[in-house]
Each structure stands twice: as C-alpha cells, then as structure tokens.
Amino acid sequence: ESALITQQDLAPQQRAAPQQKRSSPSEGLCPPGHHISEDGRDCISCKYGQDYSTHWNDLLFCLRCTRCDSGEVELSPCTTTRNTVCQCEEGTFREEDSPEMCRKCRTGCPRGMVKVGDCTPWSDIECVHKESGTKHSGEVPAVEETVTSSPGTPASPCSLSG
C-alpha cells in the first residue's frame, strides 16, 4: 500500500535550464505561462508552442500542448498560457459522451421528420417529427429511410489527442 499524505520536504535539487526565463514565486506560486522549479525557488517559463500553464500554480512542469488530430482543425495555437483549441472538421461533430473522436454528421432525417438544426462541430443535425415537433433520438436511420435534406460533407472520424 502506498502513499500521498502529509508533510515532508523535497530534497532540494537545482533545475538546470539556462535557456528559460526565471523569476521568483509569489507566495509559493508562479504566474500563468510558468511552472515552479524542483527546489521551489524559481519560476521557469513554459516553452511557446510546446507546453503551457493557464493559472497561477506550483506545477513541477508546464503541461504538454494538445496536438490537433488529422480530422480536426486548429482554431487557435498553443501559447504559454493557453492550450491548443481544436475543432472537428466541417461535416463532423464531437459529442459530450464520446469526446475522444469526431463523428460524421448524418446527411438527412428519417422519413416523417424534418431538419431543424444544422451539423455543427459540437452537434449532429437535429430532427423533429413533422406533426408533434418532438426530437429524434439521434440514432442513425437505415439508408432507405433517409430523406436527404442537404448534401453534407463526407469526413473521416478523428481522435482527440491528449
């Protein structure tokens, strides 16, 4: 059985990184875009485009930047204070319950339903029953039941890199 609990000092060890900017921690914390040195004496800047930290922190390292997958587009690059922002390519979307991959949007609604919402990077097309106006469950209909409402953009599934 092993262990994370309370109070013991780290053996001091100086961090050798002369190419990175240093400053002193403020009340034991370093500003966004920095992490703390192994001995706790210095704040060391993150490397632009490689790693980042978003808040005041005492992290022992900056966090690695996310790399957008081939099925994604990069909305904004990684900076020292913000991670990369990736978005599913046109015609694909990422669901909350399966955030690790972009799924292809349906090209149309089942028979008897009408499209009320377009494919977006975060949602599939939205279908409702013509009469009742209730939402479709989101299950992909059989091909022969599909009523095409827009051509849709073919796209391959993608994995969210971590």
Partner: nanobody, 126 residues
Framework: EVQLVESGGGLVQPGGSLRLSCAAS?????RYWMYWVRQAPGKGLEW???????????YYRDSVRGRFTISRDNFKNTLYLQMNSLKSEDTAVYYC???????????????????GAQGTQVTVSS
C-alpha cells in the same frame, strides 16, 4: 481499499538497468495520474516521474530525463518505470502514487509514506 504494490528493485552496478512495476487495485486506475517518487537514505521524498491518465503525456525530473521511462498499462492496472544508465545517486526506495492531476511542489512537499507502504529498494553500487 486502495492498494499500490511496487516491485522490481534490486542491487545493480552503475550503468545498469532495472524495471520497476506498481500493481494498482481498489480504484479506477485509468482515471488517475500516476507518479513515481523516491526517498534516499536520510532524505525527504523526491518526485521522479509522472504520467497522465491516458498514458500519452509523460514527465520527468531533470536528473532522470533521458535515462528513465515511465509507462502504464490501463488494462493490467500497472505502472512501470524503466531505469537505464543508473547512477549511485538513484539509490533510494521507490514508491508509486496516484493523484487526480499533475504533481505540484506543495503536494510533493507534504507527501508522506503510509506506515504500511513497502516501496521497492533500488541500490546502485559497484
């Protein structure tokens, strides 16, 4: 009950290699960051390496970077540390630990070893 059982330590000559393992049980292993920490004789706990929950991101303290490799098998609930080019200053008891995020200075500074924790002894000596 959370259990972390380390193994694979031993006596090795400088320049030699060892592979440490940590068998985890009692929690959802794949949801947690995992660390290796060590305690040299008469010294405090020292963070060695960390790996995120999915295993895609690995981090090392400066003195072991390029020599040690951390990895995990989320199907076997096991954490590993491959230690190459060992030096006398790597001599310590090595422990694995679970956490909800990356290691911070304050977290490592306030870490202690549970009385029941065994760790695995690594001795580098000629």
């Amino acid at each position: 009950e959370v259990q972390l059982v380390e193994s694979g330590g031993g006596l090795v000559q400088p320049g030699g290699s060892l592979r440490l393992s940590c068998a985890a049980s009692g929690f959802t292993f794949s949801r947690y960051w995992m660390y290796w920490v060590r305690q040299a004789p008469g010294k405090g706990l020292e963070w060695v390496s960390a790996i995120n929950s999915g295993g895609g991101d690995t981090y090392y303290r400066d003195s072991v970077r390029g020599r040690f490799t951390i990895s995990r098998d989320n199907f076997k609930n096991t954490l590993y540390l491959q230690m190459n080019s060992l030096k006398s200053e790597d001599t310590a008891v090595y422990y694995c630990a679970k956490a909800e995020g990356p290691p911070t200075f304050s977290l490592i500074r306030t870490m202690t070893v549970d009385p029941g924790a065994q760790g695995t002894q690594v001795t580098v000596s000629s």
